[in-house]
């Protein structure tokens, strides 16, 4: 059998196989050692017994989408049946005091691979026996702790495969310089040690995307905005736009990035090299926000100019593209071959990213201030509590609700929260009466809200002992 017979039905064309060469990966035309690594079809009854105590689930994720030329990282996490875990030696053990369907196990081990490998590798002392090999016959890498790595992961995409020895979670990085744009499929098959052979325990696949567009996300924040995720904001208060470029492998680390903004309110174009920008809308309504991001990224070098009289047609661009890996620090898997080499050429190509959003601008509460605090005199005998009136003004729209949060002087531990509806006139002047239990310093957060906005003011107040001579003090505003 060949790798492609074992690993999946996705058969890229001969052209794709030739041009999507992944550095350190091998062609799936290679032979697969079925004696050491048996192959079971889906639905084969043997899967049922491939793992003691149930089935192992493999979860495959990636940091896709990836800008072409950058590295994409894949991670596989194994989920063992209930009450099982991998220990520090790579053995699979039962968790203490954990009860599964079979009850508590007397044997601490599900798989004691340490004992197995000591028994089976005695032949030449190096552990380099005929069975410590991958499905294509390549020997396992023998760095010091390799015996504790008891799972064999075979990654397969674009007509190529990559083999990896690992534990219950592994990461592999691939350079995408030679990967066709668009969605691609990654498939992973996981085997476990079984004496002098291996047993398949899980198969998983996931779609990843390689794109020539810079993946761009924009977060928007505005003070007093009640719900930052509904794309409704307030008039006359600045909105902070923060651009995040999805570039986990830092491919664009040394690129100059330009941000071109159009806010849709006839204020023209705004060009910046800063990933954050503030903009204030002065009219209510709906506006179309557009952002274009431009970066000079490492990219393919153009073909050399054709000679004056070519005797045969020049090759197409696709066959002469050279790629190079950005020299920024990036993620790596567990094999030095996983990162592409850097050829002599160092070409740049402009890459673009786009973001568009429709935002709605409405009236809102812009500001709130406590202008006066009054200790409300209580009849004799003095009770333990104090009543205090806060006189509050606001600007902008008329609030419908007031909340006070009374907490300790650090403003961290909440002691009391009271919210109540309010009926305020156009002048936006209101009095809020609150009770304080005992003397001391309190942090008071006072918020005024309506449907779209929530404005806050804070103050520290010092409530005196119930002595008529002690004045109420605003400790800090």
């Amino acid at each position: 059998k060949r790798f492609h017979d074992v690993l999946g039905n996705e058969r890229p064309s001969a052209y794709m196989r030739e041009h999507n060469q992944l550095n350190g990966w091998s062609s799936d035309e290679n032979d697969w050692n079925e004696k050491l690594y048996p192959v079971w079809k889906r639905g084969d009854m043997r899967w049922k017994n491939s793992w003691k105590g149930g089935r192992v689930q493999a979860v495959l994720t990636s940091d896709s989408p990836a800008l072409v030329g950058s590295n994409i990282t894949f991670a596989v996490n194994l989920i063992f049946p209930r009450c099982q875990k991998e220990d520090a030696n790579g053995n699979i053990v039962y968790e203490k005091n954990c009860r599964n369907e079979a009850g508590l196990s007397a044997d601490p081990y599900v798989y004691n691979w340490t004992a197995w490998s000591e028994d089976s590798d005695g032949e030449n002392g190096t552990g380099q026996s005929h069975h410590n090999v991958f499905p294509d016959g390549k020997p396992f890498p023998h760095h010091p702790g390799w015996r504790r790595w008891n799972f064999i992961y075979v990654f397969h995409t674009l007509g190529q495969y990559f083999q990896k020895l690992g534990r219950c979670s592994v990461r592999v990085s691939v350079n995408t310089a030679n990967v066709t744009l668009g969605p691609q499929l990654m498939e992973v098959t996981v085997y476990r040690r079984h004496g002098r052979a291996y047993v398949p325990i899980a198969q998983v696949k996931d779609v990843y995307v390689v794109t020539d567009q810079i993946p761009v996300f924009v977060t928007m924040f505005q003070k007093n905005d009640r719900n930052s995720s509904d794309e409704t904001f307030l008039k006359d208060l600045p909105i902070m736009f923060d651009v995040l470029i999805h570039d986990p492998s830092h491919f664009l680390n040394y690129s100059t990035i330009n941000y071109k903004w159009s806010f849709g309110d006839n204020t023209g174009l705004f060009v910046s090299t800063n990933h954050t920008v503030n903009h204030t809308y002065v009219l209510n309504g709906t506006f179309s926000l557009n952002l274009t991001v431009k970066a000079a990224a490492p990219g393919p070098c153009p073909p050399p100019p054709p000679p004056p009289r070519p005797s045969k047609p020049t090759p197409s661009l696709a066959t002469t593209l050279k790629s190079y890996d950005s020299n920024t620090p990036g993620p790596a898997g567990d094999n030095p071959l996983e990162l592409s080499r850097i050829p002599d050429e160092n070409c740049q190509i402009n890459r673009y990213g786009h973001f568009q959003a429709t935002i709605t601008i409405v009236e809102g509460i812009l500001e709130v201030n406590i202008i006066q605090m009054t200790d409300v005199l209580m009849p004799v005998p003095w009770p333990e509590s104090s009543l205090i009136d806060f006189v509050v003004t606001c600007q902008g729209s008329i609030p419908t609700e007031v909340c006070t949060i009374i907490s300790d002087p650090t403003c961290e531990i909440t002691q009391n929260t009271v919210c109540s509806p309010v009926d305020v006139d156009e002048m936006c002047l209101l009095t809020v009466r609150r009770t304080f239990n005992g003397s001391g310093t309190y942090c008071v957060n006072l918020t005024l809200g309506d449907d779209t906005s929530l404005a806050l003011t804070s103050t520290l107040i010092s409530v005196p002992d119930r002595d008529p001579a002690s004045p109420l003090r605003m400790a800090n505003s």
């Epitope: 979860v59 994720t61 990636s62 940091d63 990282t73 894949f74 991670a75 996490n77 989920i79 875990k85 520090a88 760095h143 010091p144 702790g145 504790r148 534990r167 219950c168 979670s169 990461r171 990085s173 986990p248 620090p329 990036g330 993620p331 790596a332 898997g333 567990d334 094999n335 030095p336 996983e338 990162l339």
Partner: antibody, heavy 116, light 108 residues
């Protein structure tokens, strides 16, 4: 016994660079990713990045605007983190931590103060 | 990236009480969640891994539960040495492996 011994506190000026070390002992250095985590005063923990000591491949947290470079010296079982173009916002305690795949052993922390 | 939201941010309790800290992941992380304890001026220490397995030497009054996106750490019969900060962290999939905002547990 597994131990991660970090270098001592650093006081540097804004714009400068610093290199923090983390010497591992009591286990096979190349078997585990080494992570770096920072904690600003009174704040939560932030994952900066990790390095695979077997071949030096590193991954960084894109969200944190820390200009960090992670390296290892396998011969001395030591991991390094170099921080460049420092600002006062980089003042924090920096920890190294061994990953399997969670952080089971941590260094004692290196306090970095960036001040003019 | 996966966001971890921890609550409450702070909590005061008395010795002998039972407290629960919660952690929410922005997407399914299965059981790939850990809890750390950090005392003032010290490094964090592993408390619970795989959402519910106690690390070596951790007293049984600590217990972790949950899977998917909702997790909690329960400390029953609080002891004086339990006061400090607690952090959750995911270790699922590709980096970054983010932490929750932390919970400061103070003595009442």
């Amino acid at each position: 016994e597994v131990q991660l011994q970090q270098s001592g506190p650093e006081l540097v000026k804004p714009g400068a660079s610093v290199k923090i070390s983390c010497k591992a002992s009591g286990y096979t250095f190349t078997d585990y990713y080494m992570n770096w985590v920072r904690q600003s005063h009174g704040k939560s923990l932030e994952w900066i990045g990790d390095i695979n000591p077997y071949h030096g491949g590193s991954t960084y947290n894109q969200k944190i605007k820390v200009k960090a470079t992670l390296t290892v010296d396998k011969s001395s079982s030591t991991a390094y983190m170099e921080l460049r173009s420092l600002t006062s916002e980089d003042s924090a305690v920096y920890y190294c931590a061994r990953n399997w795949p969670y952080f089971d052993y941590w260094g004692q922390g290196t306090t970095l103060t960036v001040s003019s | 990236d996966i966001q971890m939201t921890q609550s409450p941010a702070s909590l005061s309790a008395s010795v002998g009480e039972t407290v629960t800290i919660t952690c929410r992941a922005s997407e399914n992380i299965y059981s790939f969640l850990v809890w750390y304890q950090q005392k003032q001026g010290k490094s964090p220490q592993l408390l619970v891994y795989n959402a519910k397995t106690l690390a070596e030497g951790v007293p049984s009054r600590f217990s972790g539960s949950g899977s998917g996106t909702q997790f909690s750490l329960k400390i029953s019969s609080l002891q004086p040495e339990d006061f400090g900060s607690y952090y959750c962290q995911h270790h699922f999939g590709t980096p970054p492996y983010t932490f929750g905002g932390g919970t400061k547990l103070e003595i009442k």
